[in-house]
């Protein structure tokens, strides 16, 4: 099923690499581009008898258009007013310039040995779990060469069975990997949770009447810092995959090769158990740094956080994130409005449906309107 | 936890075909051959062959090449196995199950299949 | 084909006795060798793997052992709630083969 989330950066990306073009690029939006993106993600989908799918597909298009136009104009309004938004709150934080900067500082500290141990683990976690990866598949390769020495009668016959165990547990070892792995990034989202809330409460007295504006730039912060987690999560589960994509062909060079002399079996048995040793090891050496590196982007965005609030602010491009998490409030908005419709439709008679779908145009016009409006 | 779950029992004529579903839920469905194993009263077990649900792969024991094809289907974690030109040797049941570690460790209840005319 | 013989069709023993099956090979298989009980009216269910790993749930009177071509799978004291059929099987080598079972009754 196509998921809000897969949607709202299919258009996220597609902005970001038109506003990174000319600026021409933006006012002559390429609606059939954006709408050719939208329509790959529905194409599997659409092979089974799928009326879900073609009917969220039929209105999501024209929305996502509409609202892909809205996000272009109101990009540098957007701008303005977070510049604004940062002004006031700068100014009702200068008094108390040195105590907030060191809030966020103890902040900071806490945040980094609140995630240390993750990183640690997720480390420890990756290093056992390649290490038992190795092992659950190196006793097939040794296995599948003692029956070859062996000169079993038809090695088709009693080689084959080892191959088939090796393919299938290099499928399950490598769910497994993940299943153990990506926790950690949900665990991540709840300590981003616990450190933002901590610091919202600490910086509160000195925010005062700007208490809302202050909220606004936590929650942009809360955003940036769980989409980072999103991306370790998957990066993660990417680098899992190409293992298993690297590991998958050993298997079948092993069964393609039984068909053939036995010289290249020989060959392709002997050389086995050095290629598993040499990918699962290549995994390790290049996912064991994730957590470090994620814990040092989570740090940074903090640090820029004090730099906004600070009284030396430079001219920062915080307002994307903002826009970026207003597409996906809408996006997700969408969803779940169209979700709602969608089993209310089960039960609607035809000329109540009607008037349902007339209705529900004006939302979709509506749901459109102006993102993040703020108060000035 | 680990589930397989079966169609119901058949009772078709002789030279006909019929289609087996197993249902499977609680794991990794791709990743596990599934096996298909033939139960008559007083011939004991016969192993059939087993899918690949990841690609469709298959391997079948020489015996049943021919008369048993297996599939899957990602999608609805749903194993298959089609019994063609039945005869009355085909009555039996049939168990779909999941092989791990060169055995078969969870099974479904069975479908009893009857050839009759 | 790998023929796995299971001399003994049937068996009799008492609750609280010690009773063993065994299973040859025709051939060597290693350790990849399962037993399997099967209750009347039921679906077969795995007791034992690797030729002596007890499977997730199996009571620890169950017991395997063996390698090469002859396994041994002991009840260390049979209970009623063992009535069954217990198959072995091996899986080394296609096809997979299993053998004809022995029925175990209760006195």
């Known amino acids: 099923e196509v998921s809000a989330d897969q949607v709202a950066t299919v258009m996220w990306d597609y902005f970001s690499q038109l506003s990174n073009n000319a600026k021409e690029a933006v006012e002559h939006l390429q609606k059939s581009e954006l709408t050719q993106q939208l329509n790959a993600l529905f194409q599997d989908k659409l092979g089974e008898v799928n009326t879900y799918a073609g009917d969220l597909q039929k209105k999501l298009v024209p929305f996502a258009t509409e609202l892909h136009e809205r996000l272009a104009k109101d990009s540098e309004k957007l701008k303005e007013e977070i510049g604004k938004e940062l002004e006031e709150l700068r100014a009702r934080l200068l008094p108390h310039a040195n105590e907030v900067s060191q809030k966020i500082g103890d902040n900071l500290r806490e945040l980094q040995q609140r995630l240390e141990p993750y990183a640690d683990q997720l480390r420890t976690q990756v290093s056992t779990q390649a290490e038992q990866l190795r092992r659950q598949l190196t006793p097939y390769a040794q296995r599948m060469e003692r029956v070859l020495r062996e000169n079993a009668d038809s090695l088709q016959a009693s080689l084959r069975p080892h191959a088939d165990e090796l393919k299938a547990k290099i499928d399950q070892n490598v769910e497994e990997l993940k299943g153990r792995l990506t926790p950690y990034a949900d665990e991540f989202k709840v300590k981003i949770d616990q450190t933002v809330e901590e610091l919202r409460r600490s910086l509160a007295p000195y925010a005062q009447d700007t208490q809302e504006k202050l909220n606004h730039q936590l929650e942009g912060l809360t955003f940036q810092m769980k989409k980072n987690a999103e991306e370790l999560k998957a990066r993660i589960s990417a680098s899992a995959e190409e293992l298993r994509q690297r590991l998958a062909p050993l298997a079948e060079d092993v069964r393609g090769n039984l068909r053939g002399n036995t010289e290249g079996l020989q060959k392709s048995l002997a050389e086995l158990g050095g290629h598993l040793d040499q990918q699962v090891e290549e995994f390790r050496r290049r996912v064991e740094p994730y957590g470090e590196n994620f814990n040092k982007a989570l740090v940074q965005q903090m640090e820029q956080l004090r730099q906004k609030l600070g009284p030396h602010a430079g001219d920062v491009e915080g307002h994307l994130s903002f826009l970026e998490k207003d597409l996906r409030d809408k996006v997700n908005s969408f969803f779940s409005t169209f979700k709602e419709k969608e089993s209310q439709d089960k039960t609607l008679s035809l000329p109540e449906l009607e008037q349902q779908q007339e209705q529900q145009q004006e939302q979709q016009q509506e749901q459109v309107q102006m993102l993040a409006p703020l108060e000035s | 936890q680990v589930q397989l779950q079966q169609s119901g029992a058949e009772l078709v004529k002789p030279g006909a075909s019929v289609k087996i579903s197993c249902k499977a839920s609680?794991?990794?469905?791709?990743?596990?051959?599934m096996s298909w194993v033939k139960q008559r009263p007083g011939k004991g077990l016969e192993w059939i062959g087993q899918?690949?649900?990841?690609?469709?792969?298959?391997y079948y024991n020489g015996k049943f090449r021919g008369k048993a094809t297996l599939t899957a289907d990602k999608s609805s974690s749903t194993a298959y196995m089609q019994l063609s030109s039945l005869t009355s040797e085909d009555s039996a049941v049939y168990f779909c199950?999941?092989?791990?570690?060169?055995?078969?460790?969870?099974w479904g209840q069975g479908t009893s299949l009857t050839v009759s005319s | 084909d790998i023929v796995m013989t299971q001399s003994h069709k049937f068996m009799s023993t008492s609750v609280g006795d010690r009773v063993s099956f065994t299973c040859k090979a025709s051939?060597?298989?290693?350790?990849?060798v399962a037993w399997y009980q099967q209750k009347p009216g039921q679906s077969p269910k795995l007791l034992i793997y690797?030729?002596?790993t007890r499977h997730t749930g199996v009571p620890d009177r169950f017991t395997g052992s063996g390698s090469g071509t002859d396994f041994t799978l002991t009840i260390s004291s049979a209970q009623s709630a063992d009535l069954a059929d217990y198959f072995c099987?091996?899986?080394?080598?296609?096809?997979?083969?299993f053998g004809g079972g022995t029925k175990l009754e209760i006195k």
């Open positions: 690797w030729a002596s």
């Open positions: 199950a999941r092989r791990d570690n060169y055995c078969l460790d969870f």
């Open positions: 051939q060597a298989v290693g350790s990849a």
């Open positions: 099987q091996q899986c080394s080598t296609y096809p997979c083969t």
């Open positions: 609680g794991y990794a469905f791709s990743s596990y051959w």
């Open positions: 899918v690949y649900p990841g690609d469709g792969d298959t």
